[in-house]
């Protein structure tokens, strides 16, 4: 391209400027003459002859068009423009290439696992409707009024009943298709299901046949009952339940084959339906044999109940269980039906709540676990199903036997209560990816302690340190036990402690971590590449 051509092009560009942006220079009327006829907004300036005007005109107001074109067309400026243009495009391409390299080299976001609803939070068992609702109540209609409370606990499912017709030890008077009239009608049940659905609470129905009798499956192996469970599954699935529980399956002959058959019916209806089996067994081999033939079965057992309340033993039980079950989804509880207080002293309740909510799997609680309900503290109450303490009037039998801090009402008003801790843990469990489906790594932290990390990809990570002992301990966190993907930082923020007195949100140095007796800490720290 010649210099002349370049100048011509510039001239055309300048000529096409909007009139109000054209140079106004007294020394030259060229701009106006080139612009053609007078246009709105332009003022023709008469060149003055007198000196004052000349002086004003002599005052510098920028280059004239001719001068500008002349300078712009000079080889230096042409080269500069080309260099800048080239630099711009090179820079642009460099940034593009950089972005591509970053995207290609950046670690892939880990694909989220398929999550069923029971993977997202805790299950809440109400085995005895009458005990749960208290004196003079105890039916399905009344339970509907307690759904807001269950919502406040952020539990994902309600394991209800059994509520079917059952006369103690009498097969002929056991009907898995009929609701015991003491609990209400089928219409009451349908209404409960609708209300629960609106509150995003799933309903799991316990179909343990002889729940009022000595043996849950009757004194001899009654095949007719097990056969009819199939029909009951179909009936209640059609009614809209989200799953089933059957307990004491160690008393059921050929339990594995029956469970497989029931699982097929449940999953055949929808993959979103759950089957929970309960056993009193705490033997890992027995538990594994039940799980072997039944994928997706949630099994509650007494496995953790013999943890002996020591950190090392609990760590050993948990890691053995997780190693043995592989990538199978687990559930965590201390038994298939009983309260935590049946197994634990009061000072360990908070610790176990923290553990159950942060282990990989579904935590399963019984009504009252959230407030530390203890049958032993309520004279005359059955161990399996003591009356739920909603407020101080819930147990009128012995005046003064119940204090405010034992009740739902009292604990709801106390941010340091067991109930408040339960709510906070339940909330964290249902929203943090690392707790929802994160990897689990247990590691050494010293005698008496059980500690582990939960982490998922580049999400916030959680460190749990539990002191089962009744003396204060210093945690020597052995990060060498951990894989590179789960390394420990120097400091982590305290999310919560099971004991009062610690400042939440404060960073704690992990090398100098000291735990109070029976204290559990939940700490969080960010992912570091």
């Amino acid at each position: 391209m010649s210099q002349d051509t370049e100048v011509d092009m510039k001239e055309v560009e300048l000529n096409e400027l909007e009139p109000e942006k054209q140079p106004m220079n007294a020394a030259s009327g060229a701009a106006m003459s080139l612009a053609g006829a007078e246009k709105n907004g332009l003022v023709k300036i008469k060149v003055a002859e007198d000196e004052a005007e000349a002086a004003a005109a002599a005052k510098f107001t920028g280059l004239s068009k001719e001068e500008l074109l002349k300078v712009a067309g000079s080889p230096g400026w042409v080269r500069t423009r080309w260099a800048l243009l080239l630099l711009f495009w090179l820079g642009w391409l460099g940034m593009l290439a950089g972005a591509v390299v970053i995207i290609v080299r950046a670690p892939r976001c880990r694909e989220l696992p398929a999550q069923k609803w029971w993977h997202t939070g805790a299950l809440y068992r109400i085995g005895d409707l009458q005990a749960f609702q208290g004196h003079g109540a105890g039916n399905l209609a009344g339970l509907k009024g307690r759904l807001d409370y269950l919502s406040s606990l952020k539990v994902k499912g309600l394991v209800l009943g059994p509520i079917h017709k059952n006369q103690k030890d009498d097969v002929a008077q056991t009907d898995l298709l009929q609701i015991d009239p003491n609990f209400g009608s089928k219409e009451d049940f349908d209404s409960l299901l609708q209300s629960a659905k609106k509150k995003s609470i799933r309903v799991i129905l316990d179909l343990t046949p002889n729940y009022r009798g000595e043996n849950s499956w009757f004194s001899t192996q009654v095949d007719t009952v097990a056969t009819k469970v199939k029909d009951a599954l179909e009936f209640w699935l059609q009614a809209g339940v989200d799953g089933f529980q059957v307990r004491d399956i160690e008393n059921l002959k050929d339990a594995s084959s029956f469970l497989a058959e029931w699982q097929n019916i449940t999953k055949g209806f929808s993959e979103d339906r759950l089957l929970i089996a309960g056993t009193n067994s705490s033997d890992l081999q027995q538990i594994l044999s039940l799980l072997e033939s039944n994928k997706d079965l949630l099994l509650t057992s007494s496995y953790l109940s013999d943890s002996g309340s020591t950190g090392e033993h609990t760590k050993s039980l948990v890691t053995q269980y997780l190693n043995a079950t592989g990538n199978r989804w687990c559930s965590w509880s201390l038994s298939q039906a009983r309260l935590l207080t049946s197994f634990l002293p009061a000072q360990l309740l908070r610790l176990y709540q923290l553990m159950l909510f942060t282990l990989p799997g579904t935590p399963v609680f019984s009504y009252g676990d959230e407030i530390g309900l203890d049958a032993a503290a309520l004279p005359g109450q059955p161990m399996e199903a003591p009356v739920m303490l909603w407020d101080e009037s819930s147990f009128p039998d012995i005046p003064g036997a119940v204090s405010a801090n034992m009740t739902v009402k009292g604990q709801s008003e106390d941010p340091g209560s067991l109930l408040s801790l339960f709510r906070r843990l339940s909330d964290q469990r249902s929203k943090e990816r690392s707790l929802l489906h994160g990897d689990f790594h247990a590691f050494s932290a010293g005698p008496g302690l059980f500690s582990y990390i939960r982490h998922w990809d580049q999400n916030e990570r959680f460190l749990v340190v539990l002191n089962f002992g009744d003396v204060g301990l210093s945690a020597g966190l052995q990060a060498s036990d951990l894989p590179a993907s789960a390394s420990l930082p120097a400091k982590a923020d305290l999310l919560l402690s099971t004991q009062p007195g610690r400042e939440e949100g404060s960073p704690l140095e992990l090398e100098r971590l000291k735990l109070e007796p029976h204290e559990g800490l939940l700490l969080r720290f960010p992912y570091a590449a």
């Epitope: 298709l177 009929q178 001899t220 007719t224």
Partner: antibody, heavy 115, light 107 residues
Framework: QVQLQESGPGLVKPSETLSLTCTVS????????WSWIRQPPGKGLEWIGY???????NYNPSLKSRVTISVDTSKNQFSLKLSSVTAADTAVYYC?????????WGQGTLVTVSS | DIVMTQSQKFMSTSVGDRVSVTCKAS??????VAWYQKKPGQPPKALIY???YRYSGVPDRFTGSGSGTDFTLTISNVQSEDLAEYFC?????????FGSGTKLEIK
């Protein structure tokens, strides 16, 4: 009070299919088990099978290959079909409600298999 | 299949007597046994379930007993209307099975 009434042909030719219907009145056919039982002349009672309102069935293995029990909840009826009949299928056929044992029975209908 | 054996095909008794009809299961059926009364031209009528529980409306002269494999239906103070055939039935396992029946005759 639940009442049951069997209906169907009293005579069926060998190799054909025996069809009977039981109408339930005084109660809903839903949420219960409904069975067919037969008694050949001079012999004991034999359970044929049951149906439950979802359509789930359970048959006596000795007859399973030939039996179909179905339900029509809209009509409050359930039916029995027994294929490839022989003279040995001649019996009084009863429909009954099963609660493990049988608490309500129909009057029974005699079906003779003969050419 | 569980076989229910009623060894006595016929039993003879007099009005006002006490009579016991027996039934033996080929394997343990717990208490999952029912007894029926059947009169000619009529359907069977439930008398006893769960080995010992009287069905509603059944006179208290009918009593059931036994568990495991041996079961007994006892009619005390036999009445003329008790002339009928009596069947036992197990409901411990499918297929449900009946005894062959015991006919009660009045002397």
């Amino acid at each position: 009070q639940v009442q049951l009434q069997e209906s169907g042909p009293g005579l069926v030719k060998p190799s054909e299919t025996l069809s009977l219907t039981c109408t339930v009145s005084g109660g809903s056919i839903s949420s219960s088990y409904w069975s067919w039982i037969r008694q050949p002349p001079g012999k004991g009672l034999e359970w044929i099978g049951y149906i439950y309102n979802s359509g789930s069935t359970n048959y006596n293995p000795s007859l399973k290959s030939r039996v179909t029990i179905s339900v029509d909840t809209s009509k409050n009826q359930f039916s029995l079909k027994l294929s490839s009949v022989t003279a040995a299928d001649t019996a009084v056929y009863y429909c009954a409600r099963e609660t493990y044992y049988f608490d309500y029975w129909g009057q029974g209908t005699l079906v003779t298999v003969s050419s | 299949d569980i076989v229910m054996t009623q060894s006595q095909k016929f039993m003879s008794t007099s009005v006002g007597d006490r009579v016991s009809v027996t039934c033996k299961a080929s394997q343990n059926v717990g208490i999952n046994v029912a007894w029926y009364q059947k009169k000619p031209g009529q359907p069977p009528k439930a008398l006893i379930y769960s080995a010992a529980y009287r069905y509603s409306g059944v006179p208290d002269r009918f009593t059931g007993s036994g568990s495991g494999t041996d079961f007994t239906l006892t009619i005390s103070n036999v009445q003329s209307e008790d002339l009928a055939e009596y069947f036992c039935q197990q409901y411990n396992s499918y297929p449900l099975t009946f005894g062959s029946g015991t006919k009660l005759e009045i002397k």
